[in-house]
Protein backbone atom coordinates (compact mmCIF):
# COMPACT_ATOMS: atom_id res chain seq x y z
CA UNK A 1 0.00 0.00 0.00
CA UNK A 2 0.97 3.64 -0.50
CA UNK A 3 2.66 5.20 2.58
CA UNK A 4 0.37 7.75 4.30
CA UNK A 5 0.91 11.47 3.79
CA UNK A 6 -1.25 12.48 6.77
CA UNK A 7 -2.28 10.84 10.04
CA UNK A 8 -5.28 10.89 12.35
CA UNK A 9 -5.59 13.07 15.44
CA UNK A 10 -3.23 11.95 18.22
CA UNK A 11 -0.91 10.41 15.62
CA UNK A 12 2.17 11.61 13.76
CA UNK A 13 3.93 10.64 10.56
CA UNK A 14 7.39 9.16 10.85
CA UNK A 15 9.35 6.76 8.63
CA UNK A 16 6.39 6.64 6.23
CA UNK A 17 3.96 5.41 8.87
CA UNK A 18 1.56 6.80 11.45
CA UNK A 19 2.58 6.44 15.09
CA UNK A 20 0.54 7.25 18.21
CA UNK A 21 1.51 10.37 20.12
CA UNK A 22 2.32 9.92 23.82
CA UNK A 23 -0.50 10.86 26.17
CA UNK A 24 -0.21 13.89 28.48
CA UNK A 25 2.12 13.15 31.38
CA UNK A 26 4.39 10.96 29.24
CA UNK A 27 7.36 11.59 26.93
CA UNK A 28 8.57 9.83 23.79
CA UNK A 29 11.25 7.15 24.15
CA UNK A 30 11.09 5.68 20.65
CA UNK A 31 8.89 5.92 17.57
CA UNK A 32 6.67 3.04 16.57
CA UNK A 33 7.80 0.62 13.88
CA UNK A 34 6.00 -1.79 11.62
CA UNK A 35 6.05 -4.26 14.52
CA UNK A 36 6.03 -2.12 17.70
CA UNK A 37 3.92 0.62 19.27
CA UNK A 38 5.26 4.07 20.15
CA UNK A 39 7.23 3.75 23.38
CA UNK A 40 6.45 6.39 25.99
CA UNK A 41 7.67 6.96 29.54
CA UNK A 42 5.91 8.80 32.41
CA UNK A 43 7.30 12.21 33.39
CA UNK A 44 9.34 12.24 36.58
CA UNK A 45 8.60 13.99 39.86
CA UNK A 46 8.16 17.76 39.37
CA UNK A 47 7.91 17.35 35.57
CA UNK A 48 4.96 17.58 33.18
CA UNK A 49 3.73 17.43 29.62
CA UNK A 50 0.28 18.92 29.06
CA UNK A 51 -0.66 17.62 25.59
CA UNK A 52 -0.57 14.51 23.41
CA UNK A 53 3.02 14.76 22.28
CA UNK A 54 6.26 13.35 20.93
CA UNK A 55 8.54 15.44 23.14
CA UNK A 56 11.78 13.72 24.08
CA UNK A 57 11.88 15.32 27.54
CA UNK A 58 9.32 16.46 30.07
CA UNK A 59 9.43 20.07 31.27
CA UNK A 60 10.20 21.07 34.84
CA UNK A 61 7.30 22.53 36.79
CA UNK A 62 7.44 26.28 37.02
CA UNK A 63 9.06 27.70 40.17
CA UNK A 64 7.03 30.45 41.81
CA UNK A 65 9.90 32.60 43.07
CA UNK A 66 8.92 34.43 46.29
CA UNK A 67 11.73 36.92 45.62
CA UNK A 68 9.69 38.04 42.61
CA UNK A 69 6.49 38.27 44.68
CA UNK A 70 5.17 34.95 43.34
CA UNK A 71 3.40 32.14 45.17
CA UNK A 72 1.85 28.83 44.13
CA UNK A 73 -1.79 29.09 43.13
CA UNK A 74 -2.08 25.51 41.90
CA UNK A 75 0.52 22.76 42.28
CA UNK A 76 1.56 21.05 39.04
CA UNK A 77 0.89 17.42 38.14
CA UNK A 78 2.43 15.17 35.50
CA UNK A 79 -0.11 16.67 33.06
CA UNK A 80 -0.18 20.30 34.19
CA UNK A 81 2.36 22.98 34.97
CA UNK A 82 2.39 24.73 38.34
CA UNK A 83 0.31 27.92 38.21
CA UNK A 84 1.80 30.92 39.97
CA UNK A 85 0.02 34.00 41.21
CA UNK A 86 1.19 37.18 42.96
CA UNK A 87 1.19 38.17 46.60
CA UNK A 88 -1.54 40.47 47.91
CA UNK A 89 -1.40 43.92 46.31
CA UNK A 90 0.48 42.69 43.23
CA UNK A 91 -0.50 41.15 39.90
CA UNK A 92 1.13 39.10 37.12
CA UNK A 93 2.73 40.86 34.17
CA UNK A 94 1.71 38.12 31.70
CA UNK A 95 -0.45 35.01 31.43
CA UNK A 96 2.58 32.88 32.25
CA UNK A 97 2.96 34.91 35.48
CA UNK A 98 6.74 35.17 35.43
CA UNK A 99 6.88 38.33 37.57
CA UNK A 100 4.66 40.68 39.53
CA UNK A 101 4.00 44.42 39.61
CA UNK A 102 2.24 46.54 42.19
CA UNK A 103 -1.46 47.16 41.61
CA UNK A 104 -2.11 50.52 40.00
CA UNK A 105 -3.90 53.16 42.08
CA UNK A 106 -6.62 55.33 40.59
CA UNK A 107 -5.71 59.03 40.81
CA UNK A 108 -8.01 61.72 42.22
CA UNK A 109 -10.83 62.24 39.70
CA UNK A 110 -10.85 58.51 38.94
CA UNK A 111 -12.44 55.63 40.78
CA UNK A 112 -11.92 51.89 40.80
CA UNK A 113 -14.12 50.18 38.22
CA UNK A 114 -12.65 46.73 38.87
CA UNK A 115 -10.43 45.78 41.80
CA UNK A 116 -7.17 44.08 40.81
CA UNK A 117 -6.65 40.35 41.24
CA UNK A 118 -3.51 38.20 41.24
CA UNK A 119 -3.62 38.15 37.45
CA UNK A 120 -5.18 41.47 36.45
CA UNK A 121 -4.47 45.10 37.25
CA UNK A 122 -6.83 47.67 38.72
CA UNK A 123 -9.23 49.13 36.15
CA UNK A 124 -9.94 52.84 36.71
CA UNK A 125 -12.73 54.98 35.33
CA UNK A 126 -13.20 58.77 35.33
CA UNK A 127 -15.73 59.96 37.86
CA UNK A 128 -18.85 61.07 35.97
CA UNK A 129 -20.80 64.24 36.77
CA UNK A 130 -22.31 63.85 40.22
CA UNK A 131 -19.42 61.73 41.52
CA UNK A 132 -15.92 62.40 42.85
CA UNK A 133 -12.76 60.82 44.19
CA UNK A 134 -10.28 62.90 46.18
CA UNK A 135 -7.77 60.14 46.90
CA UNK A 136 -5.32 57.94 45.04
CA UNK A 137 -6.54 54.41 45.76
CA UNK A 138 -6.56 50.86 44.43
CA UNK A 139 -9.92 50.18 46.13
CA UNK A 140 -12.04 53.34 46.32
CA UNK A 141 -14.88 53.83 43.83
CA UNK A 142 -16.15 57.25 42.81
CA UNK A 143 -18.44 58.58 45.55
CA UNK A 144 -21.66 60.47 44.81
CA UNK A 145 -21.71 64.13 45.70
CA UNK A 146 -23.40 64.89 48.98
CA UNK A 147 -27.08 65.72 48.52
CA UNK A 148 -27.45 69.05 50.30
CA UNK A 149 -31.26 69.06 49.83
CA UNK A 150 -31.78 65.89 51.88
CA UNK A 151 -29.98 67.63 54.75
CA UNK A 152 -32.09 70.72 54.29
CA UNK A 153 -28.99 72.59 53.17
CA UNK A 154 -28.01 74.36 49.98
CA UNK A 155 -24.98 74.02 47.71
CA UNK A 156 -22.44 76.65 48.61
CA UNK A 157 -19.66 75.31 46.40
CA UNK A 158 -20.19 73.07 43.37
CA UNK A 159 -18.55 69.65 43.30
CA UNK A 160 -15.99 68.48 40.74
CA UNK A 161 -14.69 65.04 39.78
CA UNK A 162 -12.11 65.52 42.58
CA UNK A 163 -14.09 67.30 45.27
CA UNK A 164 -17.43 66.94 46.98
CA UNK A 165 -19.98 69.74 47.01
CA UNK A 166 -19.87 72.07 50.01
CA UNK A 167 -23.24 72.45 51.69
CA UNK A 168 -24.34 75.38 53.82
CA UNK A 169 -27.39 76.69 55.61
CA UNK A 170 -30.20 78.23 53.62
CA UNK A 171 -30.49 82.04 53.89
CA UNK A 172 -33.85 82.47 55.74
CA UNK A 173 -35.57 85.78 55.14
CA UNK A 174 -37.09 87.11 58.37
CA UNK A 175 -40.66 88.37 58.20
Amino acid sequence: PEPPTACREKQYLINSQCCSLCQPGQKLVSDCTEFTETECLPCGESEFLDTWNRETHCHQHKYCDPNLGLRVQQKGTSETDTICTCEEGWHCTSEACESCVLHRSCSPGFGVKQIATGVSDTICEPCPVGFFSNVSSAFEKCHPWTSCETKDLVVQQAGTNKTDVVCGPQDRLRA
Epitope: Y12, I14, D31, D50, N53, R54, E55, D81, A96, C97
Partner: antibody, heavy 120, light 107 residues
Framework: QVQLVQSGGGLVQPGGSLRLSCAAS????????MSWVRQAPGKGLEWVST????????YYTDSVKGRFTTSRDNPKNTLFLQMSSLRAEDTAVYYC?????????????WGQGTLVTVSS | EIVLTQSPATLSLSPGERATLSCRAS??????LAWYQQKPGQAPRLLIY???NRATGIPARFSGSGSGTDFTLTISSLEPEDFAVYYC?????????FGQGTKVEIK
Protein backbone atom coordinates in the same frame (compact mmCIF):
# COMPACT_ATOMS: atom_id res chain seq x y z
CA GLN B 1 -1.13 27.28 3.79
CA VAL B 2 0.85 27.97 6.95
CA GLN B 3 2.14 31.53 7.28
CA LEU B 4 4.03 33.38 10.02
CA VAL B 5 4.26 37.13 9.44
CA GLN B 6 6.52 39.13 11.75
CA SER B 7 6.57 42.80 12.72
CA GLY B 8 8.09 45.12 15.28
CA GLY B 9 11.87 45.15 14.80
CA GLY B 10 14.05 48.25 14.60
CA LEU B 11 16.83 50.29 16.17
CA VAL B 12 16.81 50.68 19.94
CA GLN B 13 19.30 52.10 22.44
CA PRO B 14 20.99 49.88 25.05
CA GLY B 15 18.66 49.49 28.02
CA GLY B 16 15.62 50.08 25.81
CA SER B 17 12.62 47.91 25.03
CA LEU B 18 10.98 46.50 21.92
CA ARG B 19 8.05 44.19 21.23
CA LEU B 20 8.03 41.74 18.33
CA SER B 21 4.85 40.17 16.96
CA CYS B 22 4.26 37.09 14.85
CA ALA B 23 0.83 36.67 13.21
CA ALA B 24 0.04 33.04 12.40
CA SER B 25 -2.42 31.61 9.89
CA UNK B 26 -3.17 28.34 8.13
CA UNK B 27 -3.08 26.08 11.20
CA UNK B 28 -4.76 25.69 14.61
CA UNK B 29 -2.45 28.06 16.48
CA UNK B 30 -3.34 27.01 20.05
CA UNK B 31 -2.42 23.37 19.31
CA UNK B 32 1.24 24.14 18.62
CA UNK B 33 4.31 25.02 20.64
CA MET B 34 5.86 28.24 19.31
CA SER B 35 9.41 29.53 19.66
CA TRP B 36 11.73 32.44 18.98
CA VAL B 37 15.14 31.83 17.39
CA ARG B 38 17.70 34.55 16.68
CA GLN B 39 20.70 34.97 14.42
CA ALA B 40 23.37 37.58 15.11
CA PRO B 41 24.85 39.20 11.98
CA GLY B 42 27.07 36.66 10.19
CA LYS B 43 26.54 34.05 12.92
CA GLY B 44 24.56 30.84 13.43
CA LEU B 45 21.10 30.13 14.83
CA GLU B 46 20.39 30.38 18.56
CA TRP B 47 17.21 29.24 20.33
CA VAL B 48 15.83 32.08 22.49
CA SER B 49 12.45 31.12 23.91
CA THR B 50 9.53 28.70 23.72
CA UNK B 51 5.89 28.92 24.79
CA UNK B 52 3.55 25.95 25.05
CA UNK B 53 0.11 26.04 23.42
CA UNK B 54 -1.73 27.05 26.59
CA UNK B 55 0.43 30.16 27.04
CA UNK B 56 1.01 29.30 30.71
CA UNK B 57 4.44 27.68 30.31
CA UNK B 58 7.43 29.58 28.91
CA TYR B 59 11.14 28.80 28.60
CA TYR B 60 14.16 31.01 27.90
CA THR B 61 17.85 30.75 27.13
CA ASP B 62 19.88 31.86 30.16
CA SER B 63 21.16 35.09 28.58
CA VAL B 64 17.64 36.57 28.21
CA LYS B 65 15.96 35.28 31.40
CA GLY B 66 14.34 38.13 33.33
CA ARG B 67 14.66 40.49 30.37
CA PHE B 68 12.53 38.86 27.66
CA THR B 69 8.92 37.74 27.98
CA THR B 70 7.20 35.50 25.44
CA SER B 71 3.41 35.47 25.34
CA ARG B 72 0.65 34.48 22.95
CA ASP B 73 -2.90 35.57 22.18
CA ASN B 74 -4.52 32.36 20.96
CA PRO B 75 -7.87 33.92 19.90
CA LYS B 76 -5.90 36.36 17.72
CA ASN B 77 -3.36 33.74 16.50
CA THR B 78 -0.45 35.96 17.55
CA LEU B 79 2.86 35.34 19.28
CA PHE B 80 4.80 38.10 21.05
CA LEU B 81 8.33 38.69 22.30
CA GLN B 82 8.66 41.59 24.73
CA MET B 83 12.33 42.54 25.03
CA SER B 84 13.59 44.90 27.71
CA SER B 85 16.98 45.95 29.16
CA LEU B 86 18.34 45.33 25.68
CA ARG B 87 22.09 44.88 25.19
CA ALA B 88 24.37 45.19 22.16
CA GLU B 89 24.71 41.39 22.11
CA ASP B 90 20.94 41.07 21.54
CA THR B 91 21.44 42.54 18.05
CA ALA B 92 20.16 39.89 15.65
CA VAL B 93 17.49 38.85 13.21
CA TYR B 94 14.69 37.32 15.30
CA TYR B 95 12.56 34.54 13.83
CA CYS B 96 9.33 33.09 15.16
CA UNK B 97 9.03 29.38 14.46
CA UNK B 98 6.38 26.67 14.76
CA UNK B 99 7.10 23.23 16.19
CA UNK B 100 6.09 20.05 14.38
CA UNK B 101 2.98 18.12 15.51
CA UNK B 102 3.36 17.19 19.17
CA UNK B 103 6.82 18.66 19.72
CA UNK B 104 8.71 21.88 20.44
CA UNK B 105 11.23 21.22 17.68
CA UNK B 106 12.16 20.75 14.89
CA UNK B 107 10.69 23.93 13.46
CA UNK B 108 8.74 23.21 10.30
CA UNK B 109 7.67 26.80 9.54
CA TRP B 110 9.48 30.08 10.18
CA GLY B 111 8.58 33.76 10.01
CA GLN B 112 10.46 35.99 7.58
CA GLY B 113 12.59 37.41 10.40
CA THR B 114 12.86 40.91 11.83
CA LEU B 115 16.08 42.77 12.56
CA VAL B 116 16.65 44.15 16.05
CA THR B 117 19.64 46.50 16.33
CA VAL B 118 20.75 47.59 19.79
CA SER B 119 23.10 50.55 19.47
CA SER B 120 23.63 54.04 20.81
CA GLU C 1 23.72 21.49 27.03
CA ILE C 2 24.54 19.38 23.98
CA VAL C 3 27.12 20.92 21.64
CA LEU C 4 26.83 20.15 17.92
CA THR C 5 29.96 20.50 15.80
CA GLN C 6 29.59 20.68 12.03
CA SER C 7 32.30 19.97 9.50
CA PRO C 8 33.66 21.17 7.26
CA ALA C 9 32.97 24.87 7.89
CA THR C 10 32.94 25.42 4.11
CA LEU C 11 32.49 22.95 1.28
CA SER C 12 33.45 24.09 -2.24
CA LEU C 13 31.77 21.97 -4.91
CA SER C 14 30.43 22.20 -8.45
CA PRO C 15 26.83 21.64 -9.53
CA GLY C 16 26.19 17.94 -10.09
CA GLU C 17 28.69 16.86 -7.44
CA ARG C 18 27.82 14.97 -4.25
CA ALA C 19 27.91 16.91 -0.97
CA THR C 20 28.52 15.20 2.35
CA LEU C 21 28.04 17.31 5.49
CA SER C 22 28.84 16.08 9.00
CA CYS C 23 27.34 16.89 12.39
CA ARG C 24 28.83 15.49 15.60
CA ALA C 25 27.13 15.72 19.02
CA SER C 26 28.95 16.05 22.37
CA UNK C 27 26.72 13.24 23.69
CA UNK C 28 24.15 10.91 22.17
CA UNK C 29 21.07 12.56 20.68
CA UNK C 30 19.69 9.14 19.64
CA UNK C 31 17.85 9.76 16.34
CA UNK C 32 16.55 13.22 17.28
CA LEU C 33 18.50 15.33 14.81
CA ALA C 34 17.22 17.74 12.15
CA TRP C 35 18.83 19.61 9.25
CA TYR C 36 17.93 23.07 7.92
CA GLN C 37 18.94 24.99 4.81
CA GLN C 38 19.36 28.77 4.88
CA LYS C 39 19.94 31.05 1.92
CA PRO C 40 21.16 34.69 2.31
CA GLY C 41 18.40 37.02 3.52
CA GLN C 42 15.96 34.15 4.04
CA ALA C 43 14.62 32.20 7.00
CA PRO C 44 15.88 28.65 7.54
CA ARG C 45 13.92 25.80 5.94
CA LEU C 46 13.46 22.37 7.49
CA LEU C 47 14.96 19.66 5.28
CA ILE C 48 15.29 16.52 7.42
CA TYR C 49 13.96 15.58 10.85
CA UNK C 50 14.56 12.57 13.11
CA UNK C 51 17.83 11.87 11.26
CA UNK C 52 16.40 10.64 7.94
CA ASN C 53 12.80 11.85 7.39
CA ARG C 54 12.43 14.40 4.61
CA ALA C 55 10.16 17.35 5.42
CA THR C 56 7.21 18.16 3.16
CA GLY C 57 8.26 19.24 -0.33
CA ILE C 58 11.96 18.41 0.06
CA PRO C 59 13.49 16.75 -3.03
CA ALA C 60 14.78 13.16 -2.85
CA ARG C 61 18.37 14.27 -3.52
CA PHE C 62 18.53 15.29 0.17
CA SER C 63 19.05 12.40 2.59
CA GLY C 64 20.13 12.04 6.19
CA SER C 65 21.76 9.23 8.12
CA GLY C 66 23.50 8.41 11.39
CA SER C 67 22.61 7.82 15.03
CA GLY C 68 23.92 8.57 18.49
CA THR C 69 26.65 11.18 18.02
CA ASP C 70 27.53 11.08 14.32
CA PHE C 71 25.20 12.28 11.56
CA THR C 72 25.47 13.01 7.86
CA LEU C 73 23.45 15.10 5.41
CA THR C 74 24.01 14.04 1.83
CA ILE C 75 23.00 15.95 -1.30
CA SER C 76 23.38 13.37 -4.06
CA SER C 77 23.78 15.80 -6.97
CA LEU C 78 24.04 19.51 -6.25
CA GLU C 79 21.59 21.82 -8.00
CA PRO C 80 22.35 25.56 -8.33
CA GLU C 81 19.69 26.34 -5.71
CA ASP C 82 21.38 24.06 -3.14
CA PHE C 83 24.31 26.41 -2.51
CA ALA C 84 23.51 27.71 0.96
CA VAL C 85 24.33 27.27 4.65
CA TYR C 86 23.18 24.08 6.37
CA TYR C 87 22.55 23.72 10.10
CA CYS C 88 21.95 20.62 12.23
CA UNK C 89 19.79 20.82 15.37
CA UNK C 90 19.13 18.36 18.19
CA UNK C 91 15.97 17.87 20.25
CA UNK C 92 17.11 14.96 22.38
CA UNK C 93 17.89 17.15 25.37
CA UNK C 94 16.84 20.58 26.63
CA UNK C 95 17.58 23.22 25.48
CA UNK C 96 17.41 22.66 21.72
CA UNK C 97 20.78 23.48 20.16
CA PHE C 98 22.13 24.13 16.67
CA GLY C 99 25.44 23.42 15.01
CA GLN C 100 27.49 26.41 13.81
CA GLY C 101 26.67 25.68 10.16
CA THR C 102 28.37 24.43 7.00
CA LYS C 103 28.49 26.70 3.97
CA VAL C 104 28.18 24.91 0.63
CA GLU C 105 29.63 27.25 -2.00
CA ILE C 106 30.17 27.03 -5.74
CA LYS C 107 33.70 25.95 -6.66
Amino acid sequence: QVQLVQSGGGLVQPGGSLRLSCAASGFTFSNYVMSWVRQAPGKGLEWVSTIRGSGISTYYTDSVKGRFTTSRDNPKNTLFLQMSSLRAEDTAVYYCAKGIVGATTPFDYWGQGTLVTVSS
Amino acid sequence: EIVLTQSPATLSLSPGERATLSCRASQSVRSFLAWYQQKPGQAPRLLIYETSNRATGIPARFSGSGSGTDFTLTISSLEPEDFAVYYCQQRSDWPPTFGQGTKVEIK
